[in-house]
Interface confidence: low
């Protein structure tokens, strides 16, 4: 093994390097010193480092490590952040289109139901958007509210247009009758199933992406332990104390140090792998009624069919509801 | 027969939005994201190695620093970590991750559980309990086409409704939508390319 080069007799090189880290040279010895106060760069002979320099090296080593960690995760972080934003916007576009398709269906096929239908449809799709973004709304309640609101308008405008406008009292009765008599057949239940399944999946997909960002942010801004700070200093800077400015750490040594410093972070690995594979499984299942794009953009058609179902059974329904809500109607006619 | 929104191109009950070259749907975008994420599946286990390869490490030099002295790169001394009498790596590894990492692990465990719960079996389109009152899940033919549901002749096929890189030229807002016909028969040119939502590399 070749003998190590003699230490810099005047600490000149060390001084000029250290000046870049810390302007002002008051901490750098003029000539090598025993260094008995050093705690990290334990000297084998005279050294060009002081305790204060060691502290500065530790701080710099820690900052280097934090920057390396951030640059390591930059591409991954960008990938998830941008996709989370893109999908959120895309889902909002889908909801907007679905609302517009449904409104257009009402305008083209049931103009007498507008503008009330527009209002109910708008409220429904606002709730859909809020649900996707994480609001604590029950999907079944959203669908029930849509049909509860629509039926009184359908009854008074399509099935029984002779009724006076002041239908406030009968409205409550009609809302109740809507569920009791299964006025829309099984369509509300069908829509509930499709909408709840597709929205749940969409919501969890967005939640998962946002958690991905949180995971990267957490590991991006980790503080490293003192022991780690010392090991990094030893690896990156202690050679300078001997005037060895150009030497680099041995590869195997670096790996041991990094594994020590990263012991906690590497713990995430198992759960990160599982996260990506579980997300893949979810994405593979996002079709048919688990694909909100598919479900929401077809809603106008199912709602249309549900109104047709009501119209088909209008005769029977009008008779039953006439009896059921007679009390409310009499009060209105007075 | 059903009436459709006038702003959609209707062809034999197959609902289409105008064809876009190199069309990119939401589902293809999702799959693309997963493929890219999978290239980062070993991100955390590879971090120590990544950081060493991106910080100054002796690669071509004959000599390297082992934490205590200058040694030959392939010597036994270089392989040792040069930490004896200094820091005990075992002591360093006694401890688990710091609290913020523990918290994020707990959150990952939770989301993984949710994701597994939500990963649905790829079977019938509708739940069995929806088949009462004459609703059939039906067979919609090829996998591209999705059954939206309906009753009897009300079954509709929807083919790739929303092209990912497109948006309707006008937003079908009811105020703007032409309302002079009951039966919808729009022309091809009523639908145009949407704005790009941005590419992720």
């Amino acid at each position: 093994q070749p003998p190590p080069p003699p230490p810099d007799a005047t600490c000149h090189q060390v001084r000029s390097f250290f000046q870049r880290l810390q302007p002002g040279l008051k901490w750098v010895p003029e000539t090598p010193v025993p260094g008995s106060d050093l705690q990290v760069c334990l000297p084998k002979g005279p050294t060009c480092c002081s305790r204060k320099m060691e502290e500065k090296y530790q701080l710099t080593a820690r900052l280097n490590m934090e920057q390396l960690l951030q640059s390591a995760s930059m591409e991954l972080k960008f990938l998830i952040i941008q996709n989370a934003a893109v999908f959120q916007e895309a889902f909002e576009i889908v909801v907007r289109h679905a609302k517009n398709y449904t409104n257009a269906m009402f305008k083209n096929n049931y103009p007498s139901l507008t503008p009330q239908a527009f209002e109910f449809v708008g409220e429904f799709f606002t709730d859909v958007s809020l649900y996707i973004l994480g609001s604590d709304i029950n999907v079944d309640d959203m669908v029930n509210e849509l049909f509860d609101s629509l039926f009184p308008v359908i009854y008074t405008q399509l099935m029984n247009p002779g009724l006076p406008d002041s239908a406030l009292d009968i409205n409550e009765c009609l809302r109740g009758a809507r569920r009791d008599l299964k006025v829309f057949g099984n369509f509300p239940k069908l829509i509930m199933t499709q909408v709840s399944k597709s929205l749940q999946v969409t919501r969890i997909f967005l939640q998962a992406l946002n958690l991905g960002i949180e995971v990267i942010n957490t590991t991006d801004h980790l503080k490293f332990s003192k022991d780690c700070g010392r090991m990094l200093t030893r690896m990156w800077y202690c050679s300078y104390c001997q005037g060895l400015m150009m030497v680099k750490p041995c590869g195997g040594y670096c790996n041991v140090v990094m594994q020590g410093c990263m012991a906690g972070v590497v713990e995430i690995d198992k759960y990160w792998r599982e996260y990506i594979l579980s997300l893949e499984e979810l994405v593979n299942g996002m079709y048919r009624i688990y694909d909100m794009e598919n479900v929401l953009l077809g809603l106008f058609s199912t709602i249309h069919d549900s109104i047709q179902y009501v119209q088909k059974n209008a005769g029977k329904l009008t008779t039953t509801i006439g009896k059921l809500c007679a009390h409310s109607q009499q009060r209105q006619y007075r | 027969s059903a009436y459709y929104p006038e702003d959609l191109f209707i062809d034999k009950k197959v609902l289409k939005v105008a064809h876009v070259e190199h069309e990119e749907t939401l589902s293809s975008r999702r799959r693309e994201l997963i493929q890219k994420l999978k290239s980062f599946i070993s991100f955390y286990s590879a971090l120590p190695g990544y950081i060493c390869s991106h910080s100054p490490v002796a690669e071509n030099d004959t000599l390297c620093w082992n934490g205590q002295e200058l040694v030959e790169r392939y010597s036994q001394k270089a392989a040792r970590n040069g930490m004896k009498n200094q820091f005990n790596l075992h002591e360093l590894k006694m401890k688990g991750p710091e609290p913020v990492v523990s918290q994020i692990i707990d959150k990952l465990k939770h989301i993984n559980q949710l994701l597994r719960t939500m990963s649905m079996p790829k079977g019938r389109v509708l739940d069995k309990n929806l088949d009462e009152e004459g609703f059939e899940s039906g067979d919609c033919g090829d996998d591209e086409d999705e059954c939206i549901g309906g009753s009897g002749d009300g079954m509709i096929k929807v083919k790739n409704q929303l092209r990912f890189l497109a948006e309707l030229a006008y937003d079908l807002d009811v105020d703007d939508a032409p309302g002079n016909s009951q039966q919808a028969t729009p022309k091809d040119n009523e639908i145009s390319t949407f704005h790009n939502l941005g590419n992720v590399h």
Partner: antibody, heavy 124, light 108 residues
């Protein structure tokens, strides 16, 4: 809240074996080193063994080295102490204890700490 | 191994009076960062031990401010400014600087 519950104690003949368990709840078990400490009847506390958060590192008191084995199952949130070749002087109440938490110093570093901040009720 | 020696081994105190327990280690418990790796625990009759003080002087959460820890290197003291009836028990010091962790004999 954070809880540790030991079990598995009993009376056995010298030379025989026994396995103690410690069920943990209320904290992220897999993030903390865990200890066994014992107390002979009418005597003081004696530290027995410690295991790192992931089970990769274990340290023992000289009096039990080679006879006792500390282990953990993070999936079950359980700590174990396998005691072989038991002697009369091993008679004691055995406590499991969770190691202390991190502390931050003024420069923003966090550091390790190996004291014990939560103890179980003990098993004899 | 680091040997921990406590004194006195028994300390009768009247409620309302102060109390002081001493603990000495066979080698310094001060680490390079200036922390003393010494804990104080109390074991009340029929109960498990509980931590009072860690790192020489930091009170564990929930511990009344009547308790204080002081000292550095090899000499440490636990003080109770005003003893209450509930403070009856055996007090132990323990070093956590290196394995094996070692306890003092206890002060009753």
């Amino acid at each position: 809240q954070v809880q540790l519950q030991e079990s598995g104690g009993g009376v056995v003949q010298p030379g025989r074996s026994l396995r103690l368990s410690c069920a943990a709840s209320g904290f992220t078990f897999s993030s903390y080193a865990m200890h066994w400490v014992r107390q002979a009847p009418g005597k003081g506390l004696e530290w027995v063994a410690v295991i790192s958060y992931d089970g990769s590192n274990k340290y023992y008191a000289d009096s039990v080295k080679g006879r006792f084995t500390i282990s953990r199952d993070n999936s079950k949130n359980t700590l174990y102490l396998q005691m072989n070749s038991l002697r009369a002087e091993d008679t004691a109440v055995y406590y499991c204890a969770k190691e202390g938490t991190y502390y931050y110093d003024s420069s923003g570093y966090w550091d390790y700490y190996y004291g014990m901040d939560v103890w179980g009720q003990g098993t004899t | 191994d680091v040997v921990m020696t406590q004194s006195p081994l028994s300390l009768p105190v009247t409620p309302g009076e102060p109390a002081s327990i001493s603990c000495r280690s066979s080698q310094s418990l001060l680490d390079s960062d200036g922390y003393n790796f010494l804990d104080w625990y109390v074991q009340k009759p029929g109960q498990s031990p509980q931590r009072l003080i860690y790192l020489g002087s930091i009170r564990a959460s929930g511990v009344p401010d009547r308790f204080s820890g002081s000292g550095s290197g090899t000499d440490f003291t636990l003080k109770i400014s005003r003893v209450e009836a509930d403070d009856v028990g055996v007090y132990y010091c323990m070093q956590a600087l290196q394995t094996p962790w070692t306890f003092g004999q206890g002060t009753k």
